[in-house]
Interface confidence: low
């Protein structure tokens, strides 16, 4: 349906509060360096304009596209050339090229310092003083750090954030109330950001088909009672929603997401028995609830997969007549029967099935050729199962920090050219898979672990794409979305790597290390471990264990010393010399 004024249509659909929030998020994701005040001003002006268009749709410029209106607004920012360099050249272009140009300048690693919460009393004063501005600052700070954050979900988290402050600012001990709640929300937000970045990468690097396949598998596991047509309808709508958000079309994205939630609630009888509770909630909570809803029970009477996909005489005919539909049906049927499999594994199985049909349907006797296709899946299923088992055993033995260090060693040896901060960040996140998934029951472990690993490895791919340094990382990242994790798992030590020259400065530590929070202390030690490996890539696990043990003892000793700085400058070089000798 065509509207006279697109901006008025979105303003009316979303309501003023959500509209303004989404505009603020959009601008913060595009112009990540601009101060908050500038973005508030831009969002206010756009919202006022939209309100005017809602009142009079034929007003001046109300008929312009959202890209034109938003782009024109971005291009009025005076400091564009100074702050963003060649991004200012985008303003020379016409739509849709101008928007594509802005999108291409989004920075996944803007390097802002981590958000440090001020004193609880100060926070609560700011919250009570101007709630709207306080929440706007939250949207801005998250959006500029995560330029692909799923905007409607960010509005939901801002609402949760508001709830935390409304409750805790009344508490006797504000700090005790805020601390754990803010930390729990922070974890959720970081995971949400990484998941959406993975979805955007799927769409941008591998196309709609990849994203749709991923969604078919995921939704078929979650809604096994829904038929394939229903799953396909939801997947098609969901793909549109994420394409819009990943493309910076946040108003359309939020509006379409609300429509999808409405559709699912109106058709819950044919989707899932678990949607009832979600559907009684207001729009933001409803969509979030539907996105996180628990899995429905399997229908009791599912026939064997073999009947339709192996034994049926028409397999090749059905496949060749409509390949995507036939493979989609296979994926749907397989996924709903296997909620314990990871989505990545299900997609690998579908790929294997497709390859088998391609090969067999070209032979004289296809049925004989593909008769054992389902049995041939066994190695593909065994591989992630064994991987999860082995790594969970290692995690249980070493704990999270030790497990992260084991992964740091593993990944630094696989790709020593990758920057140290990236190796540390990614290995720390990979290590969290143990905490997140290893305590789950056997039936949920693989799905939890492998799909989480896919999201974390996507972060590696995104960071590496910005400054490509390793051909093997590029290869694993770009050849196949579903085979990324097996590709990385399969990488051996990079024998072509030339060790880094020793730099004493890298291994010089100071007394400020002692006052750092535990997590930051770990990062410092892990940074040293990576640098050590880059200098001595042939070091054995035993040697590294010894050196890291000595390093831990050195930090402990100097942090307990009377003259901390003196201890670090005296003992540090001795430790480095001993480490070099131990790693010869």
């Amino acid at each position: 349906e065509a509207y006279k004024s697109e901006i008025a249509h979105r303003y009316n659909d979303l309501g003023e509060e959500h509209f303004r929030g989404l505009v603020l998020v959009a601008f913060s994701q595009y112009l990540q360096q601009c101060p908050f005040e500038d973005h508030v001003k831009l969002a206010k002006e756009v919202t006022e304009f939209a309100k005017a268009c809602a009142a009079e749709e034929s007003g001046a410029n109300c008929d312009k596209s959202l890209h034109t209106l938003f782009g024109d607004k971005l291009c009025t920012v005076a400091s564009l050339r100074d702050k963003y360099g060649d991004m200012a050249d985008c303003c020379e272009k016409q739509e849709p090229d101008r928007n594509e140009c802005f999108l291409a300048h989004k920075d996944d690693n803007p390097g802002f310092p981590p958000l440090v919460a001020p004193e609880p009393d100060a926070l609560c004063a700011a919250f009570q003083d101007n709630e709207q501005l306080f929440l706007g600052k939250y949207l801005y700070e998250i959006a500029r750090r995560h330029p692909y954050f799923y905007a409607p979900e960010l509005l939901y988290y801002a609402q949760q954030y508001k709830g935390v402050f409304a409750e805790c600012c009344q508490a006797a001990d504000k700090a005790a109330c805020l601390g754990p709640k803010i930390e729990a929300l922070r974890e959720k937000v970081l995971l949400s950001s990484a998941k959406e970045r993975f979805k955007c990468a799927s769409l941008q690097k591998f196309g709609d088909r990849a994203f749709k396949a991923w969604s078919v598998a995921r939704l078929s596991q979650r809604f096994p009672k829904a038929d394939f047509a229903e799953i396909s309808k939801v997947v098609t709508d969901l793909t549109k929603v994420h394409k819009e958000c990943c493309h910076g079309d946040l108003l359309e994205c939020a509006d379409d997401r609300a429509d999808l939630a409405k559709y699912m609630c109106e058709n819950q009888d044919s989707i899932s028995t678990k949607l009832k509770e979600c559907c009684d909630k207001p729009v933001l909570e409803k969509s979030q609830c539907l996105a996180e809803v628990e899995r429905d029970e399997l229908p009791g009477d599912l026939p064997s997969l073999a009947a339709d996909f192996v034994e049926d005489k028409e397999v090749c005919k059905n496949y060749q007549e409509a390949k995507d539909v036939f493979l989609g049906t296979f994926l749907y049927e397989y996924a709903r029967r296997h909620p314990e499999y990871s989505v990545s594994l299900l997609l690998r199985l579908a790929k294997e099935y497709e390859a088998t049909l391609e090969k067999c349907c070209a032979t004289d006797d296809p049925p004989t050729c593909y008769a054992k296709v389902l049995d041939e899946f066994k190695p593909l299923v065994d591989e992630p199962q064994n991987l999860v088992k082995t790594n969970c055993e290692l995690f249980e033995k070493l704990g999270e920090y030790g497990f992260q260090n084991a992964l740091l060693v593993r990944y630094t040896k696989k790709a020593p050219q990758v920057s140290t901060p990236t190796l540390v960040e990614v290995s720390r996140k990979l290590g969290k898979v143990g905490t997140k998934c290893c305590k789950k029951p056997e039936s949920e472990r693989m799905s939890c672990a492998e799909d989480f690993l896919s999201v974390v490895l996507n972060r590696l791919c995104v960071l590496h794409e910005k400054t490509p340094v390793s051909e093997r990382v590029t290869k694993c990242c770009s050849e196949s979305l579903v085979n990324r994790r097996p590709c990385f798992s399969g990488l051996e030590v990079d024998e072509t790597y030339v060790p880094k020259e020793f730099n004493a400065e890298t291994f010089t530590f100071h007394a400020d290390l002692c006052t750092l929070p535990e997590a930051e202390k770990q990062v410092k030690k892990q940074t040293a471990l990576v640098e050590l490996l880059k200098h001595k890539p042939k070091a054995t696990d035993e040697q590294l264990k010894t050196v890291m043990g000595d390093f831990g003892a050195f930090v402990e000793k100097c942090c307990a010393a009377e003259n901390k700085e003196g201890c670090f400058s005296e003992e540090g070089p001795k430790l480095v010399a001993a480490a070099q000798a131990a790693l010869v």
């Epitope: 591998f206 196309g207 709609d208 390859a355 391609e358 090969k359 770009s478 050849e479 196949s480 979305l481």
Partner: nanobody
Framework: EVQLVESGGGVVQPGDSLRLSCAAS????????MGWFRQAPGKEREFVSA????????YYANSVKGRFTISRDNSKNTVYLQLNSLRPEDTALYYC?????????????????WGQGTLVTVSS
């Protein structure tokens, strides 16, 4: 529906060069991975080279690495294959292919659309 038309084949001597072109119509060219495959008489079709949507990634079969170069011009909806230092074993029908989504660039079953082929004959 994407249509692909190859051109540039011909008869050349060992050591000579050729440039194959493949013009695409009917789809958004810049969203497709493009590949070249070849089939020699009596042999199976084999992968030659492929290029990602934005030209960042290129892939080559070992047998042509260093001799063949793939490139694309999204503004012209065309993908090219430059064939240098040709050998008699390069004689084949060369096909251009397009894929909306590919997990393995080298597998022909990943490609959704195919051209009719252009013949390259290397003979002294």
């Amino acid at each position: 529906e994407v249509q692909l038309v190859e051109s540039g084949g011909g008869v050349v001597q060992p050591g000579d060069s050729l440039r194959l072109s493949c013009a695409a119509s009917g789809g958004t060219f810049s969203t497709y991975v493009m590949g070249w495959f070849r089939q020699a008489p009596g042999k199976e079709r084999e992968f030659v080279s492929a290029i990602s949507q934005n030209s960042i990634h290129t892939y080559y079969a070992n047998s042509v690495k260093g001799r063949f170069t793939i490139s694309r011009d999204n503004s012209k909806n065309t993908v090219y294959l430059q064939l240098n230092s040709l050998r008699p074993e390069d004689t084949a029908l060369y096909y251009c292919a397009a894929s909306r989504f590919t997990s393995w660039y080298t597998a022909d079953y990943e490609y959704d659309y195919w051209g009719q082929g252009t013949l390259v004959t290397v003979s002294s």
